[in-house]
C-alpha cells in the first residue's frame, strides 16, 4: 500500500524517451588492478554505517575491510567495479551516499596527448637501408591487458619502423577486423600506428592484434581488451539537490534535481498539500500533489520553477525519480517571507519525509 494519498487522480502521459539519460554522475574512484583503495563515507553524524555494492549487502572478507566510516579494498580487481553506497542510520532517519568504483587499467596503450605529435613514431629510413619492420617504442606496448569500463574510448598502439615504410592492419580474435564488426566502427591512425574504438561495449572484448609488414618481413603484437561491465541500477540523485530556498511573496524560485540513470528516468515533482484543512488522509498518509512530471508536454523535468509565489507555496517539495529498477527521492523546503524581508539562499540541506529513503 502506498505511503501517501494523491490529492487528484493525475493521469500521466506516456514519456518521450530522451536521447541520453546521464545528467550528472556520482563521484568516481579509480584504481588499477592490484592496487588498494580506501573510500570514506561522506555522511555526517552516523550512528551505524552499512555498505552495499550494486544493491547487495557488502560485508568484510579477506580483501574488504570495513572500519567505521572507511571502506578498504585490498588488491582490487575489475570485479570490484560497480555502484557502491554507504547508508548512515541515525535515530530519526537515514541517508545514503553513492559513489562509483572503476578498477581499470589505463584507457589507452599510449597517452592520448601523443596524437598531437606522432612524429616520433613515424621513423624515416635511409632509402638504401632496406629493413624488415621493427618496433620503435616498445614502452607503449608493454601493457597487454586492458580492462576498460564500458562506454570509454580505447586506443591500442604499435609504433613501428622499416624500409620501405611498413603497412599496418588489425585482427580481432585472429580474424580480419572489419568496420562492420562493431557499432560505430573504429579509427585507424596510420601516422600514429594506432587503433581507436570509441564507446566500447561488452561485445568489444577480445584479442586485438596489429600486424605490421613490408616486403622484408612481418611482426605482430596482441592486446587483450576486457570491457568491465556493471549491473544496471536505479536512479541516483546528486546530493544536496534540490536545495532549500527562500523568497519573498510575489518572488520566483527554482528547484533543481540532477539525475543519473542507466535507463529512462521518470521524474516527478511532488508537494505535501492540505485537503479539507488536513495534511493527512483518513489512513494517516500525507496528501501529495504531483506538480510536474517528465513526459511529452513537459519541458526540462529536472527543474521546477515557481513564479509569483504566495505563502501557500511554502513547504516541502519532493523530487522523485524512478526507472524500471527502482526509485530515488530527495526533497527541499521553500520558505516564503513577507515582502519587507530580503530573501537569501539557505544552506543546501536535503530533508526527507518519513517514507522516502
Amino acid at each position: 500500500r502506498p505511503s501517501f494519498s494523491l490529492v487528484e487522480d493525475t493521469t500521466l502521459e506516456p514519456e518521450e524517451p530522451p536521447t541520453k539519460y546521464q545528467i550528472s554522475q556520482p563521484e568516481v574512484y579509480v584504481a588499477a588492478p592490484g592496487e588498494s583503495l580506501e573510500v570514506r563515507c561522506l555522511l555526517k553524524d552516523a550512528a551505524v554505517i552499512s555498505w552495499t555494492k550494486d544493491g547487495v549487502h557488502l560485508g568484510p572478507n579477506n580483501r574488504t575491510v570495513l572500519i567505521g566510516e572507511y571502506l578498504q579494498i585490498k588488491g582490487a580487481t575489475p570485479r570490484d567495479s560497480g555502484l557502491y553506497a554507504c547508508t548512515a542510520s541515525r535515530t530519526v532517519d537515514s541517508e545514503t551516499w553513492y559513489f562509483m568504483v572503476n578498477v581499470t587499467d589505463a584507457i589507452s596503450s599510449g597517452d592520448d596527448e601523443d596524437d598531437t605529435d606522432g612524429a616520433e613514431d613515424f621513423v624515416s629510413e635511409n632509402s638504401n637501408n632496406k629493413r624488415a619492420p621493427y618496433w620503435t617504442n616498445t614502452e607503449k606496448m608493454e601493457k597487454r591487458l586492458h580492462a576498460v569500463p564500458a562506454a570509454n574510448t580505447v586506443k591500442f598502439r604499435c609504433p613501428a619502423g622499416g624500409n620501405p615504410m611498413p603497412t599496418m592492419r588489425w585482427l580481432k580474435n585472429g580474424k580480419e577486423f572489419k568496420q562492420e564488426h562493431r557499432i560505430g566502427g573504429y579509427k585507424v591512425r596510420n601516422q600514429h600506428w594506432s587503433l581507436i574504438m570509441e564507446s566500447v561495449v561488452p561485445s568489444d572484448k577480445g584479442n586485438y592484434t596489429c600486424v605490421v609488414e613490408n616486403e622484408y618481413g612481418s611482426i605482430n603484437h596482441t592486446y587483450h581488451l576486457d570491457v568491465v561491465e556493471r549491473s544496471p541500477h536505479r536512479p541516483i540523485l546528486q546530493a544536496g539537490l534540490p536545495a532549500n530556498a527562500s523568497t519573498v511573496v510575489g518572488g520566483d524560485v527554482e528547484f533543481v534535481c540532477k539525475v543519473y540513470s542507466d535507463a529512462q528516468p521518470h521524474i516527478q515533482w511532488i508537494k505535501h498539500v492540505e485537503k479539507n484543512g488536513s495534511k493527512y488522509g483518513p489512513d494517516g498518509l500525507p496528501y501529495l500533489k504531483v506538480l510536474k512530471h517528465s513526459g511529452i508536454n513537459s519541458s526540462n523535468a529536472e527543474v521546477l520553477a515557481l513564479f509569483n509565489v504566495t505563502e501557500a507555496d511554502a513547504g516541502e517539495y519532493i523530487c522523485k525519480v524512478s526507472n524500471y529498477i527502482g526509485q530515488a527521492n530527495q526533497s527541499a523546503w521553500l520558505t516564503v517571507l513577507p515582502k519587507q524581508q530580503a530573501p537569501g539562499r539557505e544552506k543546501e540541506i536535503t530533508a526527507s519525509p518519513d517514507y522516502l529513503e
Partner: antibody, heavy 114, light 107 residues
Framework: QVQLVQSGAEVKKPGSSVKVSCKAS????????VHWVRQAPGQGLEWIGS????????TYDEDYRGRATITADKSTSTAYMELSSLRSEDTAVYYC???????WGQGTLVTVSS | DIQMTQSPSSLSASVGDRVTITCKGS??????IAWYQQKPGKAPKLLIY???YRYSGVPSRFSGSGSGTDFTFTISSLQPEDIATYYC?????????FGQGTKLEIK
C-alpha cells in the same frame, strides 16, 4: 546469494481470487522494484505490474488495473500479487522478478478451472 | 503502450551458425531494451540489458545492438545449449512490454 522464492501451485474456481507470494533474500529488498510477469501455457511473457517496496508505489498494465493488487511487506522482504475475478484464461505461470530483471522466482502455476 | 514486434517467431539453425533475431519498437525507446533466454519449465534468464550490455556471466557469443526503434540480438556461434525461446523487452516506459518470442531449434 540473491534468491526469490515463490509460493506453491494453486487451483482456483472462476470468479475467485488468488494471492501469490515472493520472498526475497540476498539483497536490499527496499532498493529494487519487484515486477510480476505471467506466462500462459505455450504463450509469451506478459508484464502485470510492479511495486517499489520502500514506499509501496505500484504501477500496473492497464489490462490488470483494478483486478491485480501488488503489495509488499518490508518486515519479511516479501512481495505479493493478488488477482481477483479469476477466469480460465488466467491459467498461467506467474513469476516475480527483481527490479533489474536479473533474478526471477521459480514461478507459480495458477490453474483456474470449474 | 509500446509494442515490440519480434521476428522471426521461430528459426532453425545448425551448431556453429550465426543467429540473428530482431525486435522493432512502435516508439523510440533509446537503448532501453533487454533480451532474455527461456528454456521449457524455467524462468527467463537475462542475457542483455540496455541494448548491448551483456549481463554478468553471460557467454561472449551473445550480443545485442541497436537504438531507437530497431534492435538486433546475435548468437555468433550457435551451441546446442542455446536451444530455447528468446524474448526482447522494452524497459523504457510502463507497461514494460515483451516481444512475442523467437523459438530457436537445431537443424
Amino acid at each position: 546469494q540473491v534468491q526469490l522464492v515463490q509460493s506453491g501451485a494453486e487451483v482456483k474456481k472462476p470468479g475467485s481470487s488468488v494471492k501469490v507470494s515472493c520472498k526475497a533474500s540476498g539483497y536490499i529488498f527496499t532498493s529494487y522494484n519487484v515486477h510480476w510477469v505471467r506466462q500462459a501455457p505455450g504463450q509469451g511473457l506478459e508484464w502485470i505490474g510492479s511495486i517499489y517496496p520502500d514506499n509501496g508505489d505500484s504501477t500496473y498494465d492497464e489490462d490488470y488495473r483494478g483486478r491485480a493488487t501488488i503489495t509488499a511487506d518490508k518486515s519479511t522482504s516479501t512481495a505479493y500479487m493478488e488477482l481477483s475475478s479469476l477466469r480460465s484464461e488466467d491459467t498461467a505461470v506467474y513469476y516475480c522478478a527483481r527490479g533489474d530483471f536479473a533474478y526471477w522466482g521459480q514461478g507459480t502455476l495458477v490453474t483456474v478451472s470449474s | 503502450d509500446i509494442q515490440m514486434t519480434q521476428s522471426p517467431s521461430s528459426l532453425s539453425a545448425s551448431v556453429g551458425d550465426r543467429v540473428t533475431i530482431t525486435c522493432k519498437g512502435s516508439n523510440g525507446i533509446s537503448n532501453d531494451i533487454a533480451w532474455y533466454q527461456q528454456k521449457p519449465g524455467k524462468a527467463p534468464k537475462l542475457l542483455i540489458y540496455s541494448a548491448s550490455y551483456r549481463y554478468s556471466g553471460v557467454p561472449s557469443r551473445f550480443s545485442g545492438s541497436g537504438s531507437g526503434t530497431d534492435f538486433t540480438f546475435t548468437i555468433s556461434s550457435l551451441q546446442p545449449e542455446d536451444i530455447a525461446t528468446y524474448y526482447c523487452q522494452q524497459h523504457s516506459t510502463t507497461p514494460y512490454t515483451f516481444g512475442q518470442g523467437t523459438k530457436l531449434e537445431i537443424k
